[in-house]
Interface confidence: medium
């Protein structure tokens, strides 16, 4: 079999062999080598001699294989748009942002670029848990039976109603979606004397 | 040769101080990060900090924020790690360890051979 | 945090056979550009760390071809393909995909 072309390498019909590390190079007509994630090019390939990486420098980076001539500026999270950061920025990686507690992206373009405040669900109801926290507004749903939410809030959940009996109370009120079940101490015995029936 | 020498290690008492030093020889230590990584006897081991090539971003674990402090002088080819408010728990064999990259914080790929550091009343 | 689990804690080899280490992360290390955010140690007995392999699959400078890494977005295996005498020791496998970085519990490789 024949031997794997290794970069610089001639190629008439335009393509490289490994389409994420390698590229056309057109005024020569040949593939080149790509440079890793966390580099760029520092001298551009010629027929013979092979792209020169290097490292990008501190506060800059390149996510892919690449032939650009220039990292990328790591930017900070934007708190004034609600953003805090999860992971710094590295050569191969930019700054991995996410909505601050509390807050929703309500703009994305590749990423999140906005947050907003997440709306208040009312007594009664709670938050719809997601998937992804921070991904969406809330979307609000009735508590299930047997629980209750008292207040208006973004992150309130259903708590179940209390039981009474497990206080060794007896219930006064029941309850309901919106408010928990009210318990009183259990009546005195009636005395001896009031336990028949009366009559008039 | 590539060579990292810990020193500074010792017995303090919980609530104390101590200072470590790792000496870099046979690369050019402004254009790595550099990292701590510690060993609790008999346990696997714990990252404790890392610090970029230049000294300008440093990141921590959780059980060490606000206590311990990485810098580093390029001058001198040395990395620091200043410890305040020592807990037993801190009782550790602490290595010194390259970065592959200049701000990276992954691929350790060379390790010193670690200063012991023990604290104790 | 990342939390990085391996199996099994201890493992026993025959020299001359190949073994393989498992290593489970709660959320995955594959990076948006294709990269697994993941590196192996090897510590042998009495010394310090060394690398073993970095970014999921590629192998340090002066690591024999015997060692390979792989795995998706949660789940990595080492292989150690002919197990030699010096390759005894703690292997670990640490998350770089954020920090805190985490390192799994190690996997203690013997000799039968």
């Known amino acids: 079999s024949q031997p794997q072309a290794v970069p610089p390498y001639a190629s008439e019909n335009q393509t490289c062999r490994d389409q994420e590390k390698e590229y056309y190079e057109p005024q020569h007509r040949i593939c080149c080598s790509r440079c890793p994630p966390g580099t760029y090019v520092s001298a551009k390939c010629s027929r013979i001699r092979d792209t020169v990486c290097a490292t990008c420098a501190e506060n800059s980076y390149n996510e892919h294989w690449n032939y650009l001539t220039i990292c990328q500026l790591c930017r900070p999270c934007d708190p004034v748009m609600g953003l805090e950061e999860i992971a710094p920025c590295t050569s191969k990686r930019k700054t991995q942002c996410r909505c601050q507690p509390g807050m929703f992206c309500a703009a994305w373009a590749l990423e999140c670029t906005h947050c907003e405040l997440l709306s208040d669900c009312p007594p009664g109801t709670e938050a719809e848990l997601k998937d992804e926290v921070g991904k969406g507004n809330n979307h609000c749903v009735p508590c299930k039976a047997g629980h209750f939410q008292n207040t208006s809030s973004p992150s309130a959940r259903c708590q179940p109603h209390t039981r009474c009996e497990n206080q060794g109370l007896v219930e006064a009120a029941p309850g309901t979606a919106q408010s928990d079940t009210t318990c009183k101490n259990p009546l005195e015995p009636l005395p001896p004397e009031m336990s028949g029936t009366m009559l008039m | 040769e590539v060579q990292l020498l810990e020193s500074g290690g010792g017995l303090v008492q919980p609530g104390g101080s101590l200072r470590l030093s790792c000496a870099a020889s046979g690369f050019t230590f402004s254009s790595y990060a550099m990292s701590w990584v510690r060993q609790a006897p008999g346990k696997g081991l714990e990252w404790v900090s890392t610090i970029s090539g230049s000294g300008g971003s440093t990141y921590y674990a959780d059980s060490v924020k606000g206590r311990f402090t990485i810098s580093r002088d390029n001058s001198k080819n040395t990395l620091n790690l200043q410890m305040n408010s020592l807990r037993a728990e801190d009782t550790a064999v602490y290595y010194c360890?390259?970065?592959?990259?200049?701000?990276?914080?992954?691929?350790?790929?060379?390790w010193g051979q670690g200063t012991t550091v023990t604290v104790s009343s | 945090d990342i939390v990085m689990t391996q199996s099994p804690l201890s493992l026993p080899v025959t020299l001359g056979e190949s073994a393989s280490i498992s290593c489970r992360s709660s959320?995955?290390?594959?990076?948006?550009?294709?990269?697994?955010?993941l590196d192996w140690y090897l510590q042998k007995p009495g010394q310090s760390p060394q690398l073993l392999i970095y970014l999921g699959s590629n192998r340090a400078s002066g690591v024999p071809d015997r060692f390979s890494g792989s795995g998706s977005g949660t789940d990595f295996t080492l292989k150690i393909s002919r197990v030699e005498a010096e390759d005894v020791g703690v292997y670990y496998c640490?998350?770089?995909?954020?920090?805190?970085?985490?390192f799994g519990g190690g996997t203690k490789v013997e000799i039968k």
């Open positions: 959320q995955s290390l594959l990076y948006s550009s294709g990269y697994i955010d």
């Open positions: 360890a390259k970065v592959r990259d200049n701000w990276n914080y992954d691929g350790m790929d060379v």
């Open positions: 640490m998350q770089t995909i954020q920090t805190p970085l985490t």
